[in-house]
Structure formats: C-alpha cells, structure tokens
C-alpha cells in the first residue's frame, strides 16, 4: 500500500522534519503549510486549521515561502542620482543602482545605501585607476614626458607628441606644440580612454567577493556632489 | 559578547605574519568587522572591512599587503609581507550590525605587532 | 576620498565647561560619521553615529550634529574622565579617520 500522504496541519514523526513549503508551528506543534512569495501568514495555524495567507499590500513584499505576519517594507523611491534596475512588486524589493558618473559609496550589505559621484581627475593629473560599481576613480599626477589637459574620470595621461622642432614644450596639463608639419606621436591615437567602470581588484575599497558580489543597489540619497580632492575636481 | 586579537609578535621584515580576531557571544553571519591599526603615538588606521556575504574592503594603501578572512568564530588579518611602517598596536572591531553605515562598537584589547631587523 | 580632517588638534578646557570639535570629510558622506573617544592603552569607545545618534550608554552630555562634509561634536559639562583623544569616523565603504583631537581637562 502506499503511504498516506499527510495534509497540513499535520503532526509529524517523532525525529523527521516538516517537507518542502511547511514549516513547524512550536505553538501548535504541528506542521503548516507556508505562504508563497507575495503573500504573509494573515492567520497562524492551530492544531485544526492550516495557516490563512493573504497577498501582500502596495510597497510591500515577501520574496521567499514565508509564515511572516506582515510583509516587508520595499525600499524607498530610488533618488535622482540612481536608476530603478528593478520595481517594488509583491515578490521583489525595489532595486536602484547608481548612474552613470556615480558609485556605490556605502554598501554593507546586499543593496546600496549611498551614491557618490566618481571623482574627476583635474588638468595635469589622469586617472590611475578606474571606477567602478563600487569603488571611486584614482588619480594621478601625469609623469615627466605625459599630459593631461580635460576635467575627465576617465582620461589617462597622454604622451607628449614629439617633435622635429619643438615651438612650446609640454608640461604635465598641456601638450608639446611643434613647428614642423608632421609630429609623430609615440602612441596609438585611439588610446586615450579607459573604459569605464572597469572591474579591478586593486581598486580602492574595491570589494573582493566571496563567493559573489551582491547586485549595487540604493535606498538614501547623498548631501551634495563631492569637493575638490587633490588632483580632482567634483565639478 | 567579546571580541579579543592574538598573533602580535617581533618579526623581521618580509615575514608573513597572521592576526587573530577571536569572538565569543557573536554569530559572525549577523555582523560585519572591521581591522584597524595604530601607529605609537599616532592616530587611527582602518585597514579593511569584511561584510558577512564575504565581500571585503580595503583601504587603498592596504589593497594587496594585507588580506582579511574569516571562520565560524574568528576573523584573521594576514599580513603578507610586513616592513618597519607596520609597527602598530592591531585592532579588531565588530560593527553595530544593519545595513546603515559602517561604525564599530565593540573592540578588542589589540593585539602589538614589532616588524625590525 | 577617505581623507578626514579634523580640528583642532588639541584643546585645554576647564571642568564643567564645553569643548567643541570639527570635522571635515572630503566628498559628501550624509549623515554616516561616527565619533569615538580613545584613552592611552584602551581601544576606541564609539560615542556617536549617524552623525547625531548617541551610542548605548554614553551620556547626553555628548552630542553631535553636521551632514554632508561638516560634521561637530559638543562635549557639555565636562569631567575629568571625558580627557581623552577624539577621533571621528566616515562610516561609507571607504572608512577614513579624522587625525584625533586631544581634550586636556584642566
């Protein structure tokens, strides 16, 4: 014969757990069915009667089987610095993420509590390191023989063109202008920026995932852009 | 709950050295730590941070000399490859939990770290 | 970013009087800066966070106020036990100290 199947609310075996989408209820001592992603344990059960679920209300969600008396709160509306990546449904929270030209300045756990913009590296100084999701752009002051003459967080330090005959020297914000009609540069035209963001690992506070990272995402908005920084502007 | 370093010793520069953060009273899964370091007579120095996904932040000037992990009931500092500027009284600290800001609340004794030829 | 500073470096005040810090972050962090005080030998006692909030058990005598980049933490009626060094603290992924203010209690 085959064996029963039991329907919740049920007493289980002594030793044996509860099956897949029930849970063990230590008031009724019994096993109960689970309520499904979007909905909330609106009656606990009792020895009788299975758990009563009820949806969840607007702006709020449960995103796994659940006995939770009330659903969760979604986060707040994503502000003017983020992009909404995911909406507030009954089954998901609202995931924001900050946009282009910013990054995830406080994340502690899945989500993103502030954005910040990437800073911009300032004439005479290109960027060292890339942004990224979460880390901000490295400067650096461009080296003897390089250049570096935009407001950019993206821009790197370019060699001077050399000349036959040199009209102006280069310095560290400015190329060498030449007399002669035909300067030769010592590097490829196209490389000039660094795409952006670029993953790397020795990126300043760049997380190190174990096992993956968590998506960025952001609830609470920054005061203001960021101020001037050595070798940077937050303009 | 308490939070207490072990490992700090004399060693002579380019010897790995690793740190201990031992806790006791604390589910590691529910807060994140942190590492930090004073110099004799100087200030604060955050090393790094490690949330309880895994993921792990370091300050820039640490990215790569130094590595954080982390057991069921400790939270260990590696120092890779210390030199003289690493001498430094170390210091473990449990973060107040959340998700809001990072702020620590509870911080062991520390542990002295000497690195000299 | 990360780059605290804070100010002044020392301060004398008398018993029972107030003693006002400062602190300037170099890029906008809202309200996520904390205030620990330090005694010689001890690790840091975290007093403030949220830029206002009091930690547990930490008298209402401290207070601190500020958002964005300037942030101030007020130490009212001072005793004897409040001399101490004062750092504070950016509680954004990039954590950074201010360099400590010293409070003599004369």
């Known amino acids: 014969l085959p064996a029963q199947v039991a329907f919740t609310p049920y007493a289980p075996e002594p030793g044996s757990t509860c099956r897949l989408r029930e849970y063990y209820d230590q008031t009724a001592q019994m096993c109960c069915s689970k309520c499904s992603p979007g909905q909330h344990a609106k009656v606990f059960c009792t020895k009788t009667s299975d758990t009563v679920c009820d949806s969840c209300e607007d702006s709020t969600y449960t995103q796994l089987w659940n006995w939770v008396p009330e659903c969760l709160s979604c986060g707040s509306r994503c502000s003017s610095d983020q992009v909404e990546t995911q909406a507030c449904t009954r089954e998901q929270n609202r995931i924001c993420t900050c946009r282009p030209g910013w990054y995830c300045a406080l994340s502690k756990q899945e989500g993103c509590r502030l954005c910040a913009p990437l800073r911009k590296c300032r004439p005479g100084f290109g960027v060292a390191r890339p942004g990224t999701e979460t880390s901000d752009v490295v400067c650096k002051p461009c080296a003897p023989g390089t250049f570096s003459n935009t407001t950019s967080s993206t821009d790197i330090c370019r060699p001077h063109q050399i000349c036959n005959v040199v009209a102006i020297p280069g310095n560290a914000s400015m190329d060498a202008v030449c007399t002669s009609t035909s300067p030769t540069r010592s590097m490829a035209p196209g490389a000039v920026h660094l795409p952006q963001p670029v993953s790397t690992r020795s990126q300043h506070t760049q997380p190190t995932p174990e096992p993956s990272t968590a998506p960025s995402t952001s609830f609470l908005l920054p005061m203001g852009p960021s101020p001037p920084a050595e070798g940077s502007t937050g303009d | 709950q308490s939070v207490e370093e072990s490992g700090g010793r004399l060693v002579t520069p380019g010897t790995p050295l690793i740190l201990t953060c031992t806790v006791s009273g604390i589910d590691l899964s529910n807060y994140a730590m942190g590492w930090f370091r004073q110099a004799p007579g100087e200030g604060l120095e955050w090393i790094g941070s490690?949330?309880?996904?895994?993921i792990t932040y370091y300050a820039n000037w640490a990215e790569g000399r130094f590595t954080i992990s982390r057991t069921s009931t400790t939270v260990d500092l590696e120092i890779t490859s210390p030199t003289t500027e690493d001498t430094a009284t170390y210091f473990c600290g449990r973060d107040v939990g959340g998700d809001g800001g990072w702020y620590f609340n509870l911080w062991g004794p520390g542990t002295l770290v000497t690195v000299s030829s | 970013a990360g780059d605290m500073t804070q100010t002044p470096a020392s301060v004398e005040v008398a018993v029972g009087g107030t003693v006002t810090i400062k602190c300037q972050a170099s890029?906008?962090?809202?309200?996520?800066l904390a205030w620990y005080q330090q005694k010689p030998g001890q690790p840091p006692k975290l007093l403030i966070y949220?830029?206002?909030k009091l930690a547990s058990g930490v008298p209402s005598r401290f207070s601190g106020s500020g958002s964005g980049t300037e942030f101030t933490l007020t130490i009212s009626d001072l005793e004897c036990a409040d001399a101490a060094t004062y750092y504070c603290q950016q509680g954004i992924n990039n954590i950074g100290f201010g360099g400590g203010t010293e409070v003599v209690v004369k």
């Open positions: 949220d830029a206002s």
């Open positions: 490690r949330r309880t996904d895994g």
């Open positions: 890029q906008s962090i809202n309200i996520y």
